[in-house]
Interface confidence: medium
Protein backbone atom coordinates (compact mmCIF):
# COMPACT_ATOMS: atom_id res chain seq x y z
CA UNK A 1 0.00 0.00 0.00
CA UNK A 2 1.21 3.39 -1.10
CA UNK A 3 0.08 6.82 -0.17
CA UNK A 4 0.91 9.45 -2.21
CA UNK A 5 0.20 13.38 -1.10
CA UNK A 6 0.32 16.57 -2.98
CA UNK A 7 0.57 20.05 -2.97
CA UNK A 8 -1.41 22.82 -4.93
CA UNK A 9 -1.40 26.28 -3.33
CA UNK A 10 -2.91 25.17 0.11
CA UNK A 11 -4.64 22.30 -1.58
CA UNK A 12 -2.76 18.16 -1.74
CA UNK A 13 -5.13 15.13 -2.20
CA UNK A 14 -4.38 11.78 -1.06
CA UNK A 15 -3.39 8.90 -3.71
CA UNK A 16 -3.25 5.45 -2.84
CA UNK A 17 -1.80 2.70 -5.00
CA UNK A 18 -1.26 -1.18 -4.15
CA UNK A 19 1.46 -3.31 -5.38
CA UNK A 20 -0.24 -5.70 -7.83
CA UNK A 21 0.74 -8.53 -9.86
CA UNK A 22 -0.20 -9.53 -13.37
CA UNK A 23 -0.64 -12.72 -14.76
CA UNK A 24 1.14 -12.51 -18.33
CA UNK A 25 -1.60 -13.22 -21.04
CA UNK A 26 -4.18 -12.00 -18.91
CA UNK A 27 -5.94 -8.75 -18.78
CA UNK A 28 -4.22 -6.99 -15.55
CA UNK A 29 -5.50 -4.00 -13.25
CA UNK A 30 -3.11 -1.32 -11.98
CA UNK A 31 -4.85 -0.43 -8.81
CA UNK A 32 -5.13 3.41 -8.03
CA UNK A 33 -7.62 5.41 -5.76
CA UNK A 34 -8.13 9.22 -4.87
CA UNK A 35 -10.43 11.51 -3.00
CA UNK A 36 -13.99 12.02 -4.92
CA UNK A 37 -14.48 15.09 -6.98
CA UNK A 38 -17.74 15.18 -8.49
CA UNK A 39 -16.66 17.28 -10.98
CA UNK A 40 -15.51 15.26 -13.67
CA UNK A 41 -14.13 17.40 -16.36
CA UNK A 42 -11.99 18.75 -13.71
CA UNK A 43 -10.05 15.35 -12.99
CA UNK A 44 -7.10 14.26 -15.07
CA UNK A 45 -5.60 11.28 -14.58
CA UNK A 46 -2.19 10.59 -15.83
CA UNK A 47 -0.23 7.02 -15.17
CA UNK A 48 3.49 7.36 -16.25
CA UNK A 49 5.70 3.85 -16.16
CA UNK A 50 9.29 4.65 -15.15
CA UNK A 51 11.83 4.72 -17.73
CA UNK A 52 9.50 4.63 -20.66
CA UNK A 53 9.11 8.62 -22.85
CA UNK A 54 5.29 8.84 -23.39
CA UNK A 55 2.42 8.15 -21.11
CA UNK A 56 0.84 4.97 -20.33
CA UNK A 57 -2.46 6.73 -20.03
CA UNK A 58 -4.37 9.35 -19.79
CA UNK A 59 -8.08 10.54 -19.14
CA UNK A 60 -8.94 14.31 -18.77
CA UNK A 61 -12.45 16.47 -19.20
CA UNK A 62 -14.52 13.00 -18.95
CA UNK A 63 -12.49 10.98 -21.73
CA UNK A 64 -9.58 9.29 -23.17
CA UNK A 65 -6.63 11.33 -24.40
CA UNK A 66 -3.83 8.80 -25.86
CA UNK A 67 -2.11 11.70 -27.83
CA UNK A 68 0.86 11.14 -25.55
CA UNK A 69 0.87 7.24 -25.16
CA UNK A 70 3.61 5.18 -25.40
CA UNK A 71 3.80 2.78 -28.88
CA UNK A 72 3.98 -0.37 -26.21
CA UNK A 73 0.71 0.48 -24.25
CA UNK A 74 -1.48 1.33 -27.96
CA UNK A 75 -4.94 -0.29 -27.03
CA UNK A 76 -3.85 -1.73 -24.28
CA UNK A 77 -5.62 0.28 -21.32
CA UNK A 78 -9.12 1.79 -20.01
CA UNK A 79 -9.63 3.29 -16.67
CA UNK A 80 -13.27 2.45 -15.70
CA UNK A 81 -14.29 5.85 -16.97
CA UNK A 82 -17.78 5.57 -15.10
CA UNK A 83 -15.88 5.40 -11.69
CA UNK A 84 -14.01 7.87 -11.92
CA UNK A 85 -15.97 10.92 -10.12
CA UNK A 86 -16.13 8.17 -7.22
CA UNK A 87 -12.17 8.29 -6.98
CA UNK A 88 -11.32 5.30 -9.06
CA UNK A 89 -8.27 5.23 -10.96
CA UNK A 90 -7.39 2.11 -11.81
CA UNK A 91 -6.11 1.15 -14.99
CA UNK A 92 -7.17 -1.76 -17.03
CA UNK A 93 -4.52 -3.62 -18.76
CA UNK A 94 -4.74 -5.76 -21.62
CA UNK A 95 -2.70 -8.54 -22.63
CA UNK A 96 -0.09 -8.52 -19.68
CA UNK A 97 3.61 -9.40 -20.54
CA UNK A 98 6.72 -10.01 -19.04
CA UNK A 99 7.97 -6.65 -20.10
CA UNK A 100 4.91 -4.98 -18.24
CA UNK A 101 6.54 -5.21 -14.89
CA UNK A 102 8.02 -1.75 -13.57
CA UNK A 103 7.62 1.37 -11.59
CA UNK A 104 4.14 3.01 -12.71
CA UNK A 105 3.38 6.24 -11.05
CA UNK A 106 -0.73 6.88 -10.94
CA UNK A 107 -0.57 10.55 -11.19
CA UNK A 108 -4.09 12.63 -10.17
CA UNK A 109 -5.09 16.37 -10.55
CA UNK A 110 -8.83 17.58 -9.64
CA UNK A 111 -10.36 20.99 -8.53
CA UNK A 112 -9.51 19.48 -4.85
CA UNK A 113 -5.56 20.15 -5.85
CA UNK A 114 -2.71 17.01 -7.09
CA UNK A 115 -1.26 14.54 -5.67
CA UNK A 116 0.62 11.42 -6.78
CA UNK A 117 1.31 7.51 -5.82
CA UNK A 118 4.16 5.00 -7.17
CA UNK A 119 3.09 1.51 -7.94
CA UNK A 120 4.94 -1.87 -7.97
CA UNK A 121 3.71 -3.89 -11.03
CA UNK A 122 5.20 -7.36 -11.40
CA UNK A 123 4.43 -9.56 -14.10
CA UNK A 124 5.07 -13.66 -14.25
CA UNK A 125 2.52 -16.25 -14.11
CA UNK A 126 0.52 -18.05 -11.91
CA UNK A 127 -2.64 -20.88 -11.79
CA UNK A 128 -4.03 -23.00 -9.16
CA UNK A 129 -3.02 -26.59 -8.56
CA UNK A 130 -4.75 -29.57 -9.23
CA UNK A 131 -4.27 -33.03 -7.42
CA UNK A 132 -5.82 -36.11 -8.49
CA UNK A 133 -5.40 -39.97 -7.37
CA UNK A 134 -3.25 -41.56 -9.76
CA UNK A 135 -4.38 -44.73 -10.34
CA UNK A 136 -2.13 -46.03 -13.29
CA UNK A 137 1.03 -46.11 -10.92
CA UNK A 138 2.22 -49.07 -9.76
CA UNK A 139 1.67 -47.66 -5.78
CA UNK A 140 -1.14 -45.70 -4.75
CA UNK A 141 0.52 -42.04 -5.68
CA UNK A 142 -0.80 -38.08 -6.32
CA UNK A 143 -0.33 -35.63 -8.94
CA UNK A 144 -0.35 -32.35 -8.71
CA UNK A 145 -0.57 -30.08 -11.96
CA UNK A 146 -1.11 -26.37 -12.87
CA UNK A 147 -1.05 -25.29 -16.21
CA UNK A 148 0.83 -22.22 -16.03
CA UNK A 149 3.85 -20.75 -13.81
CA UNK A 150 6.62 -18.11 -14.54
CA UNK A 151 9.58 -17.81 -13.29
CA UNK A 152 9.98 -21.53 -11.84
CA UNK A 153 8.26 -22.21 -9.05
CA UNK A 154 9.64 -24.32 -6.31
CA UNK A 155 7.12 -27.11 -5.18
CA UNK A 156 6.86 -28.60 -1.93
CA UNK A 157 4.62 -31.99 -0.67
CA UNK A 158 3.02 -31.39 2.85
CA UNK A 159 0.90 -34.32 5.00
CA UNK A 160 -1.56 -33.77 7.80
CA UNK A 161 -0.74 -36.70 9.30
CA UNK A 162 3.07 -37.25 8.70
CA UNK A 163 3.73 -33.01 9.88
CA UNK A 164 7.38 -31.92 9.06
CA UNK A 165 7.93 -34.63 7.00
CA UNK A 166 10.17 -34.45 3.98
CA UNK A 167 8.61 -35.76 0.62
CA UNK A 168 11.34 -34.54 -1.93
CA UNK A 169 12.78 -38.45 -1.93
CA UNK A 170 9.29 -39.81 -2.68
CA UNK A 171 8.22 -36.95 -5.22
CA UNK A 172 9.27 -36.18 -8.55
CA UNK A 173 8.53 -32.51 -10.07
CA UNK A 174 9.05 -31.78 -13.96
CA UNK A 175 8.51 -28.46 -15.95
CA UNK A 176 6.94 -28.47 -19.42
CA UNK A 177 7.19 -25.28 -21.38
CA UNK A 178 4.20 -24.41 -22.78
CA UNK A 179 3.69 -23.26 -26.55
CA UNK A 180 4.09 -19.29 -25.97
CA UNK A 181 7.48 -20.73 -24.41
CA UNK A 182 7.49 -18.23 -21.39
CA UNK A 183 5.19 -19.85 -18.78
CA UNK A 184 5.57 -23.69 -17.67
CA UNK A 185 3.17 -26.31 -17.02
CA UNK A 186 3.77 -27.55 -13.54
CA UNK A 187 3.91 -31.30 -13.16
CA UNK A 188 4.45 -33.34 -9.40
CA UNK A 189 3.91 -36.81 -8.68
CA UNK A 190 3.60 -38.07 -4.95
CA UNK A 191 4.49 -41.77 -4.30
CA UNK A 192 3.59 -44.22 -1.85
CA UNK A 193 0.70 -42.37 -0.06
CA UNK A 194 -1.97 -43.66 2.30
CA UNK A 195 -5.15 -43.55 2.62
CA UNK A 196 -7.59 -41.65 5.06
CA UNK A 197 -4.59 -38.63 5.12
CA UNK A 198 -4.90 -35.32 3.48
CA UNK A 199 -1.73 -34.33 1.36
CA UNK A 200 -0.83 -30.58 -0.01
CA UNK A 201 0.94 -29.73 -2.97
CA UNK A 202 2.58 -26.11 -2.55
CA UNK A 203 3.64 -24.30 -5.35
CA UNK A 204 5.74 -20.80 -5.00
CA UNK A 205 7.75 -18.44 -6.90
CA UNK A 206 8.65 -14.37 -6.10
CA UNK A 207 5.15 -13.88 -7.21
CA UNK A 208 2.33 -15.99 -5.86
CA UNK A 209 1.78 -18.76 -3.49
CA UNK A 210 -0.69 -21.58 -4.61
CA UNK A 211 -1.76 -24.40 -2.18
CA UNK A 212 -3.62 -28.11 -3.50
CA UNK A 213 -5.17 -29.73 -1.10
CA UNK A 214 -6.72 -33.62 -1.47
CA UNK A 215 -8.26 -35.82 1.22
CA UNK A 216 -8.33 -39.07 0.67
CA UNK A 217 -10.48 -41.96 2.36
CA UNK A 218 -11.96 -45.16 1.69
CA UNK A 219 -15.28 -43.56 0.58
CA UNK A 220 -14.04 -40.22 -0.63
CA UNK A 221 -11.87 -37.95 -2.69
CA UNK A 222 -12.33 -34.09 -1.42
CA UNK A 223 -10.54 -31.54 -2.88
CA UNK A 224 -9.33 -27.58 -2.17
CA UNK A 225 -7.13 -25.27 -3.23
CA UNK A 226 -6.36 -21.69 -3.04
CA UNK A 227 -3.97 -19.26 -4.86
CA UNK A 228 -2.60 -16.21 -3.38
CA UNK A 229 -0.28 -13.22 -4.20
CA UNK A 230 2.80 -12.17 -2.44
CA UNK A 231 4.07 -8.65 -1.15
CA UNK A 232 0.50 -7.40 -2.68
CA UNK A 233 -1.73 -4.56 -1.11
CA UNK B 1 -24.18 0.86 -36.78
CA UNK B 2 -20.85 -0.93 -37.49
CA UNK B 3 -21.09 -2.96 -40.30
CA UNK B 4 -18.14 -5.46 -41.20
CA UNK B 5 -17.65 -6.82 -44.57
CA UNK B 6 -15.26 -9.88 -45.62
CA UNK B 7 -14.05 -10.12 -49.38
CA UNK B 8 -11.47 -12.59 -50.57
CA UNK B 9 -11.02 -15.71 -52.86
CA UNK B 10 -13.48 -18.38 -52.24
CA UNK B 11 -11.15 -21.26 -53.00
CA UNK B 12 -7.13 -21.81 -52.14
CA UNK B 13 -4.52 -24.21 -53.13
CA UNK B 14 -2.92 -26.46 -50.90
CA UNK B 15 -0.05 -24.64 -49.80
CA UNK B 16 -0.79 -21.44 -51.06
CA UNK B 17 -1.86 -18.15 -49.21
CA UNK B 18 -5.26 -17.18 -48.25
CA UNK B 19 -5.94 -13.36 -48.39
CA UNK B 20 -9.00 -11.64 -46.98
CA UNK B 21 -9.85 -8.52 -46.47
CA UNK B 22 -12.48 -6.96 -43.79
CA UNK B 23 -14.19 -3.27 -45.09
CA UNK B 24 -15.41 -1.70 -41.85
CA UNK B 25 -18.29 0.79 -42.51
CA UNK B 26 -20.63 3.54 -39.69
CA UNK B 27 -17.47 3.29 -37.52
CA UNK B 28 -13.41 3.90 -37.53
CA UNK B 29 -11.10 1.59 -37.52
CA UNK B 30 -9.49 3.75 -35.41
CA UNK B 31 -11.58 3.55 -32.75
CA UNK B 32 -10.32 2.23 -29.41
CA UNK B 33 -11.88 -1.56 -30.72
CA UNK B 34 -9.34 -4.38 -31.65
CA UNK B 35 -10.88 -5.99 -34.66
CA UNK B 36 -10.21 -9.77 -34.96
CA UNK B 37 -10.56 -12.89 -37.41
CA UNK B 38 -12.28 -15.47 -36.36
CA UNK B 39 -13.12 -19.00 -38.41
CA UNK B 40 -15.32 -21.89 -38.33
CA UNK B 41 -14.84 -24.90 -40.18
CA UNK B 42 -17.90 -26.21 -41.76
CA UNK B 43 -20.37 -27.93 -39.36
CA UNK B 44 -17.46 -27.28 -36.31
CA UNK B 45 -17.09 -24.63 -33.81
CA UNK B 46 -15.13 -21.42 -33.83
CA UNK B 47 -11.35 -20.59 -33.19
CA UNK B 48 -9.99 -17.16 -33.20
CA UNK B 49 -7.05 -16.21 -35.67
CA UNK B 50 -5.56 -12.89 -34.55
CA UNK B 51 -6.53 -9.17 -33.38
CA UNK B 52 -5.31 -5.97 -34.61
CA UNK B 53 -5.17 -2.42 -33.46
CA UNK B 54 -5.30 0.98 -35.58
CA UNK B 55 -1.83 1.22 -34.30
CA UNK B 56 -0.67 -2.33 -35.87
CA UNK B 57 -0.26 -4.15 -32.82
CA UNK B 58 -1.37 -7.71 -32.93
CA UNK B 59 -2.26 -10.79 -31.06
CA UNK B 60 -2.23 -14.17 -33.02
CA UNK B 61 -3.44 -17.54 -31.73
CA UNK B 62 0.08 -19.89 -31.09
CA UNK B 63 -1.58 -22.56 -32.76
CA UNK B 64 -1.57 -20.26 -36.28
CA UNK B 65 1.12 -17.32 -35.37
CA UNK B 66 3.69 -19.12 -37.48
CA UNK B 67 1.83 -18.60 -40.72
CA UNK B 68 -0.57 -15.84 -39.84
CA UNK B 69 0.14 -11.83 -40.80
CA UNK B 70 -3.06 -9.78 -39.91
CA UNK B 71 -2.38 -5.64 -41.07
CA UNK B 72 -4.75 -2.69 -41.11
CA UNK B 73 -5.15 0.01 -43.99
CA UNK B 74 -6.28 3.01 -42.08
CA UNK B 75 -6.96 5.00 -45.10
CA UNK B 76 -9.49 2.41 -46.28
CA UNK B 77 -10.62 2.05 -43.13
CA UNK B 78 -10.22 -2.14 -43.57
CA UNK B 79 -7.97 -4.73 -42.07
CA UNK B 80 -6.91 -7.78 -43.84
CA UNK B 81 -6.04 -11.53 -42.91
CA UNK B 82 -3.05 -13.56 -44.83
CA UNK B 83 -2.57 -17.79 -43.63
CA UNK B 84 0.41 -18.86 -45.97
CA UNK B 85 0.83 -22.85 -46.36
CA UNK B 86 -2.53 -23.71 -46.49
CA UNK B 87 -3.83 -27.40 -45.71
CA UNK B 88 -7.36 -28.92 -46.31
CA UNK B 89 -7.58 -28.35 -42.50
CA UNK B 90 -7.88 -24.43 -43.24
CA UNK B 91 -10.84 -24.91 -45.04
CA UNK B 92 -13.56 -22.72 -43.19
CA UNK B 93 -16.17 -20.11 -43.12
CA UNK B 94 -13.35 -17.06 -41.94
CA UNK B 95 -15.20 -14.40 -39.95
CA UNK B 96 -14.42 -11.08 -39.19
CA UNK B 97 -15.57 -9.40 -35.77
CA UNK B 98 -15.05 -6.36 -33.65
CA UNK B 99 -14.12 -6.52 -30.06
CA UNK B 100 -16.67 -4.88 -27.43
CA UNK B 101 -14.56 -2.73 -25.93
CA UNK B 102 -16.05 0.33 -24.62
CA UNK B 103 -14.24 3.08 -22.64
CA UNK B 104 -14.09 1.55 -18.89
CA UNK B 105 -15.46 -2.08 -19.81
CA UNK B 106 -13.40 -5.08 -21.05
CA UNK B 107 -12.12 -6.25 -24.21
CA UNK B 108 -12.36 -9.40 -25.68
CA UNK B 109 -16.49 -10.30 -26.86
CA UNK B 110 -17.34 -9.90 -30.18
CA UNK B 111 -20.07 -7.38 -30.45
CA UNK B 112 -20.17 -6.59 -34.39
CA UNK B 113 -19.71 -9.77 -36.79
CA UNK B 114 -19.23 -9.62 -40.86
CA UNK B 115 -21.27 -12.43 -42.16
CA UNK B 116 -19.28 -14.55 -42.99
CA UNK B 117 -16.75 -16.08 -46.20
CA UNK B 118 -16.36 -19.31 -46.77
CA UNK B 119 -12.61 -20.20 -47.73
CA UNK B 120 -12.30 -23.78 -49.28
CA UNK B 121 -8.42 -25.28 -49.71
CA UNK B 122 -8.44 -27.80 -52.71
CA UNK B 123 -6.64 -28.12 -55.68
CA UNK C 1 -4.50 -22.85 -24.02
CA UNK C 2 -7.92 -22.98 -22.29
CA UNK C 3 -10.31 -25.32 -23.05
CA UNK C 4 -14.41 -24.32 -22.90
CA UNK C 5 -16.54 -27.16 -22.73
CA UNK C 6 -20.35 -27.15 -23.39
CA UNK C 7 -23.19 -29.82 -21.99
CA UNK C 8 -25.07 -31.26 -23.33
CA UNK C 9 -24.15 -31.12 -26.68
CA UNK C 10 -27.66 -31.01 -27.68
CA UNK C 11 -30.37 -30.49 -25.64
CA UNK C 12 -34.43 -30.90 -26.87
CA UNK C 13 -36.78 -28.55 -24.77
CA UNK C 14 -40.63 -27.55 -25.74
CA UNK C 15 -41.57 -24.54 -26.27
CA UNK C 16 -42.17 -22.10 -23.16
CA UNK C 17 -39.84 -24.27 -21.32
CA UNK C 18 -37.03 -23.57 -19.65
CA UNK C 19 -33.75 -24.15 -21.14
CA UNK C 20 -30.25 -24.60 -19.06
CA UNK C 21 -26.76 -24.78 -20.86
CA UNK C 22 -23.93 -25.03 -18.79
CA UNK C 23 -20.37 -24.29 -19.93
CA UNK C 24 -17.57 -25.07 -18.25
CA UNK C 25 -13.81 -23.39 -18.56
CA UNK C 26 -10.30 -25.87 -17.92
CA UNK C 27 -8.93 -22.73 -15.50
CA UNK C 28 -10.38 -20.14 -14.31
CA UNK C 29 -11.73 -16.84 -16.52
CA UNK C 30 -12.95 -14.97 -13.37
CA UNK C 31 -16.04 -12.98 -15.27
CA UNK C 32 -15.03 -12.51 -18.48
CA UNK C 33 -17.29 -15.03 -20.84
CA UNK C 34 -19.43 -14.45 -23.24
CA UNK C 35 -22.47 -16.33 -24.63
CA UNK C 36 -23.43 -16.11 -28.15
CA UNK C 37 -25.82 -17.49 -30.74
CA UNK C 38 -25.71 -19.02 -34.40
CA UNK C 39 -28.52 -19.78 -36.28
CA UNK C 40 -27.64 -21.60 -39.44
CA UNK C 41 -25.81 -19.79 -42.51
CA UNK C 42 -25.20 -16.79 -39.64
CA UNK C 43 -22.68 -15.21 -38.13
CA UNK C 44 -22.45 -16.15 -33.98
CA UNK C 45 -24.79 -13.10 -32.53
CA UNK C 46 -23.12 -11.47 -28.53
CA UNK C 47 -26.08 -12.14 -26.18
CA UNK C 48 -24.29 -12.39 -22.70
CA UNK C 49 -20.54 -10.38 -21.67
CA UNK C 50 -19.49 -10.41 -18.29
CA UNK C 51 -20.69 -13.27 -17.67
CA UNK C 52 -24.45 -11.52 -17.04
CA UNK C 53 -24.34 -8.77 -18.71
CA UNK C 54 -27.14 -8.86 -21.60
CA UNK C 55 -25.91 -7.40 -24.83
CA UNK C 56 -27.80 -4.44 -25.99
CA UNK C 57 -31.29 -5.69 -27.44
CA UNK C 58 -31.17 -8.90 -25.94
CA UNK C 59 -34.63 -9.59 -24.37
CA UNK C 60 -34.60 -10.48 -20.75
CA UNK C 61 -35.39 -14.35 -21.04
CA UNK C 62 -31.59 -14.37 -21.45
CA UNK C 63 -29.59 -14.68 -18.74
CA UNK C 64 -25.96 -15.61 -17.87
CA UNK C 65 -24.74 -16.67 -14.38
CA UNK C 66 -21.22 -18.05 -12.80
CA UNK C 67 -17.78 -16.75 -12.23
CA UNK C 68 -14.37 -18.87 -11.97
CA UNK C 69 -14.50 -21.85 -14.32
CA UNK C 70 -18.63 -22.67 -14.19
CA UNK C 71 -21.09 -20.90 -16.30
CA UNK C 72 -24.76 -21.12 -17.03
CA UNK C 73 -26.73 -19.48 -20.23
CA UNK C 74 -30.18 -19.76 -19.18
CA UNK C 75 -33.52 -18.93 -21.49
CA UNK C 76 -36.61 -18.55 -19.33
CA UNK C 77 -38.92 -19.53 -21.46
CA UNK C 78 -38.38 -20.54 -25.28
CA UNK C 79 -39.31 -18.85 -27.95
CA UNK C 80 -39.62 -20.44 -31.41
CA UNK C 81 -36.55 -18.52 -32.73
CA UNK C 82 -34.20 -19.08 -29.84
CA UNK C 83 -33.60 -22.52 -31.72
CA UNK C 84 -30.38 -22.68 -32.74
CA UNK C 85 -26.68 -23.16 -31.45
CA UNK C 86 -25.51 -21.51 -28.10
CA UNK C 87 -21.63 -20.86 -27.98
CA UNK C 88 -19.41 -19.73 -24.75
CA UNK C 89 -16.44 -17.91 -25.34
CA UNK C 90 -13.89 -16.71 -22.40
CA UNK C 91 -11.91 -13.66 -22.83
CA UNK C 92 -9.54 -13.62 -19.98
CA UNK C 93 -6.57 -15.02 -21.64
CA UNK C 94 -5.38 -14.96 -25.00
CA UNK C 95 -6.07 -16.73 -27.34
CA UNK C 96 -9.87 -16.64 -26.70
CA UNK C 97 -11.62 -19.59 -27.28
CA UNK C 98 -14.95 -20.94 -27.71
CA UNK C 99 -16.98 -23.91 -26.55
CA UNK C 100 -17.95 -26.56 -29.29
CA UNK C 101 -21.65 -25.56 -28.93
CA UNK C 102 -25.01 -26.42 -27.49
CA UNK C 103 -27.71 -27.24 -30.30
CA UNK C 104 -30.63 -26.53 -28.74
CA UNK C 105 -33.54 -28.32 -30.70
CA UNK C 106 -37.35 -28.49 -30.25
CA UNK C 107 -38.48 -31.15 -28.76
Known amino acids: LIIGFGISGKHFITVTTFTSAGNIGEDGTLSCTFEPDIKLNGIVIQWLKEGIKGLVHEFKEGKDDLSQQHEMFRGRTAVFADQVVVGNASLRLKNVQLTDAGTYTCYIRTSKGKGNANLEYKTGAFSMPEINVDYNASSESLRCEAPRWFPQPTVAWASQVDQGANFSEVSNTSFELNSENVTMKVVSVLYNVTINNTYSCMIENDIAKATGDIKVTDSEVKRRSQLQLLNSG | QVQLQESGPGLVKPSGTLSLTCAVSGGSISSSNWWSWVRQPPGKGLEAIGE???????NYNPSLKSRVTISVDKSKNQFSLKLSSVTAADTAIYYCARDGYSSGWYWGYFDYWGQGTLVTVSS | EIVMTQSPATLSVSPGERATLSCRASQSVNSNLAWYQQKPGQAPWLLIYGASTRATGIPARFSGSGSGTEFTLTISSLQSEDFAVYYC?????????FGQGTKLEIK
Open chain 2, 52 to 58: IYHSGNT
Open chain 3, 89 to 97: QQYNHWPYT
